[in-house]
Interface confidence: medium
């Protein structure tokens, strides 16, 4: 029951990391225009993302465009594009691998076939948050580097937007959910074949342990 | 229609300095950076500094740094550049240009221009 | 500093030709780089923003592309009216032109 309690936390995690990485990649906050104590740096306020940038002029009006062409983008941008959607995209094949081998679904009968599905998608769901951690942590690196660099001029240095505080969350959830899915299975496959216990027999130590075994000076 | 007018020619013996003003119209004067830009009579185009109207804050060319001065005047959406220590090798013509950043390309360009100001500097 | 190398420094073309004109910056400036065109007397012109991106009301012979340190600035067929000198003018790092290519007649 534990074991199940553990997956679905897990899955719920994993969704909310997916639906946080969606907005990540859709919002036009991934770069922002600086701000050194309370005054803005720039006239022009600029909101950069990975679609489109947005400008809020000091009076106030706000423009949004997306971007003209691909091809004419430069090609961190482009990759940061690519890994995020490929990053939504295994997120959504994790999901699927979930669901068919989920203690609540019939897709597969077998214990041991559910348990391995279980842990795949559990390490697809952290190969999905590392691949969103990726562009992230890329585009947070170019910020930090450019605003400490005195060539560049005060107009372009930006600061880090709300889209990559997103994109970690994002990031931070998947591999969350994807590693507490990864560590159902050794109890989701504990009634299966002995072939299976086997393979994670080193687990099985710390699930049998009774309270005795643990030293006597941390109980009142 | 966006317009940037230049205070007139100077002739300025060596030592002096020179001010030279930029007034804008047609658009919001605190919403775009001003620059600076010189270009020597048969040479080439050489950017000296830029202001954020909002705020006053500037940014230099290394290369005048010592000598250049912008400030900006809100109330009469008038930019200024002064050159102190006048050389002969600053003979030439300054324009004010204005930034605008350009949507769906993540760049900048300076779209708008002065007519440009001679400064001539000779003893 | 940033150095920003435009070749050839003048060229010579007739009515019709097609121009091309090269600008490679010292380091990466990523797509942040304009061109402009400037006739005898007159203030700059910008054709050309964000490396490939034509300005509003300026014809479609014209054409730059490239990014990174590499960059092309393009006339597909000269007319008379474009005979003037052109700038490459990078902004990733503060603001730095090219030396100019002056297109002349033949």
């Known amino acids: 029951m534990a074991s199940a309690g553990m997956q679905i936390l897990g899955v719920v995690l994993t969704l909310l990391g997916w639906v946080n990485g969606l907005v990540s990649c859709a919002l036009p906050m991934w770069k922002v225009t600086a701000f050194i104590g309370n005054s803005i740096v720039v006239a022009q306020v600029v909101w950069e993302g990975l679609w489109m940038s947005c400008v809020v002029q000091s009076t106030g009006q706000m423009q949004c465009k997306v971007y003209d062409s691909l091809l004419a983008l430069p090609q961190d941008l482009q990759a940061a594009r690519a890994l995020c959607v490929i990053a939504l995209l295994v997120a959504l094949f994790g999901l699927l691998v979930y669901l068919a081998g989920a203690k609540c679904t019939t897709c597969v009968e077998e214990k041991d076939s559910k348990a391995r599905l279980v842990l795949t998608s559990g390490i697809v769901f952290v190969i999905s948050g590392v691949l969103t951690l990726i562009p992230v942590c890329w585009t947070a690196h170019a910020i930090i580097r450019d605003f400490y660099n005195p060539l560049v001029a005060e107009a372009q240095k930006r600061e880090l937007g709300a889209s990559l505080y997103l994109g970690w969350a994002a990031s931070g959830l998947l591999l969350l959910g994807g590693g507490l899915l990864c560590c159902t299975c050794p109890s989701g496959g504990s009634q299966g074949p002995s072939h299976y216990m086997a393979r994670y027999s080193t687990s099985a130590p710390a699930i049998s342990r009774g309270p005795s075994e643990y030293p006597t000076k941390n109980y009142v | 229609e966006v317009q940037l007018v230049q205070s007139g020619a100077e002739v300025k013996k060596p030592g002096a300095s020179v001010k030279v003003s930029c007034k804008a119209s047609?658009?919001?004067?605190?919403?775009?950076?001003m620059n600076w830009v010189r270009q020597a009579p048969g040479q080439g185009l050489e950017w000296m500094g830029e202001i954020n109207p909002a705020t006053g804050s500037t940014t230099y060319n290394q290369k005048f740094k010592a000598r250049v001065t912008i400030t900006r005047d809100t109330s009469t959406s008038t930019a200024y550049m002064e050159l102190s220590s006048l050389r002969s090798e600053d003979t030439a013509v300054y324009y004010c240009?204005?930034?605008?950043?350009?949507?769906?390309?993540?760049?900048?360009?300076?779209?708008?221009w002065g007519q440009g100001t001679l400064v001539t500097v000779s003893s | 500093d940033i150095q920003m190398t435009q070749s050839p420094s003048s060229l010579s073309a007739s009515v019709g030709d097609r121009v091309t004109i090269t600008c490679q910056a010292s380091q990466s400036v990523s797509n942040n780089l304009n061109w402009y065109q400037q006739k005898p007397g007159k203030a700059p012109k910008l054709l050309i923003y964000?490396?490939?991106k034509l300005e509003d009301g300026v014809p479609s012979r014209f054409s730059g592309s490239g990014s990174g340190t590499d960059f092309t600035f393009t006339i597909s067929s000269l007319q008379p009216e474009d005979f003037a000198t052109y700038y490459c003018?990078?902004?990733?790092?503060?603001?730095?032109f090219g030396q100019g290519t002056k297109v002349e007649i033949k």
């Open positions: 047609g658009y919001t004067f605190t919403g775009y950076y």
């Open positions: 240009a204005r930034r605008d950043y350009y949507l769906g390309s993540n760049s900048y360009a300076l779209d708008y």
């Open positions: 003018l990078q902004h990733r790092y503060m603001w730095t």
């Open positions: 964000g490396a490939s």
